[in-house]
């Protein structure tokens, strides 16, 4: 999905208000000096498909995210505010029920989750100019 | 507990340099940006630039392009501002800050650095 | 640049009374706006980042509100220790810019 055409103000707002307190919910216990970011951004689109594909594709000892109620928030905002998104998602979602695992915290995600809110840092204050 | 400390202060000639070092602690230094304000004596605060540690990446204030240079050492976690052509303009407190946890606002500052040119 | 134009510039305030300060941008800055306080002989400090969620810690006693160009920042009752120089500041563009400040005295 090109995420060019998305109202990114309003994703900003939806984060704000919400996503981001659940960011930290999920985080909370871990030392600020534990994760160092690795994956980065560089402009609104682009931060945007890096945040997609951390919160909802399973990875190699974080399969979980995407129910998270964070990740459920992001999708909302997204098919809200993204034209064309949440069709996009459909055939996605259909694979993701047949592998849907228990919840479970483990120490990669919440280097993946940390890895998110560097992303959503950069996706709020893009350091380009013309951003 | 998140510290910025900066460097002491500093008296300079005019034309010549300062380089002002603000050392940062209790956080994973690379994932926040540091950014640098000054104020000169009785005025308000004025941004010079940021710096995104990680990468390097910096912006900076038109006003100050050419003769502010903003550095990081992660290696140390410090961040370094340096102001060349110095005038008497430029006398002011210098400070670092990281920006909050969201990307919005700046949450912590270093305590300041008096830098004063004079001849 | 963003001009961010702080009135007023000064404000006295009997304790427990309520203080308001205005800050108007030159253009619209959606609700990228944050409020600082700068107490005394001390650094800046977070209050309000965009526009009304408060930092952590910070009473809510103190409130932001406004979008695009108009913005308020409240004092619902002052307190001596609210004595200092508030800022409001915009990120919405390069280069980030500040109000000139508005100092709060306590009568």
């Known amino acids: 999905y090109d995420f060019t055409n998305c109202d990114f103000e309003k994703i900003k707002a939806a984060y704000l208000s919400t996503i981001s307190k659940d960011l930290i919910t999920y985080m909370s216990g871990t030392k600020s000096t534990e994760f160092n970011n690795t994956v980065s951004c560089s402009n609104r689109p682009h931060c945007l498909t890096e945040i997609q594909s951390l919160t909802f594709n399973p990875t190699a000892g974080c399969a979980s995210l995407a129910k998270e109620m964070f990740a459920m928030k992001t999708k909302a905002a997204l098919a809200i505010w993204c034209p064309g998104y949440s069709e996009t998602q459909i055939n996605a979602t259909q694979a993701m029920k047949k592998r849907r695992k228990r919840k479970v915290t483990t120490n990669k995600c919440l280097e993946q989750v940390s890895q998110l809110q560097g992303l959503w840092r950069r996706f709020n204050r893009p350091l380009l100019k013309q951003q | 507990e998140v510290q910025l400390v900066q460097s002491g202060a500093e008296v300079k000639k005019p034309g010549s340099s300062v380089k002002v070092s603000c050392k940062a602690s209790g956080y994973a230094f690379s994932n926040y940006l540091i950014e640098w304000v000054r104020q000169a004596p009785g005025q308000g605060l004025e941004w010079i630039g940021v710096i995104d540690p990680g990468n390097g990446d910096t912006n900076y204030n038109e006003n100050f392009k050419g003769r502010a240079t903003l550095t990081a050492d992660k290696s140390t976690s410090t961040a370094y501002m340096e102001l060349s052509s110095l005038r008497s303009e430029d006398t002011a407190v210098y400070y670092c800050?990281?920006?909050?946890?969201?990307?919005?606002?700046?949450?912590?500052w270093g305590q300041g650095t008096t830098v004063t040119v004079s001849s | 640049s963003i001009v961010m134009t702080q009135t007023p510039l000064s404000l006295s305030v009997t304790p427990g009374q309520p203080a308001s300060i205005s800050c108007k941008a030159s253009?619209?800055?959606?609700?990228?706006v944050t409020w600082y306080l700068q107490k005394p002989g001390q650094s800046p400090q977070l209050l309000i980042y965009y526009v009304s969620n408060h930092y952590t810690g910070v009473p809510d006693r103190f409130s932001g509100s406004g979008s695009g160009t108009d913005f308020t920042f409240k004092i619902s009752r002052v307190e001596a220790e609210d004595v200092g120089v508030y800022y409001c500041q915009q990120h919405h563009r390069f280069p980030l810019t500040f109000g000139q400040g508005t100092k709060l005295e306590i009568k």
């Open positions: 800050a990281r920006e909050d946890n969201t990307g919005t606002a700046f949450d912590y």
């Open positions: 253009q619209s800055v959606s609700s990228d």
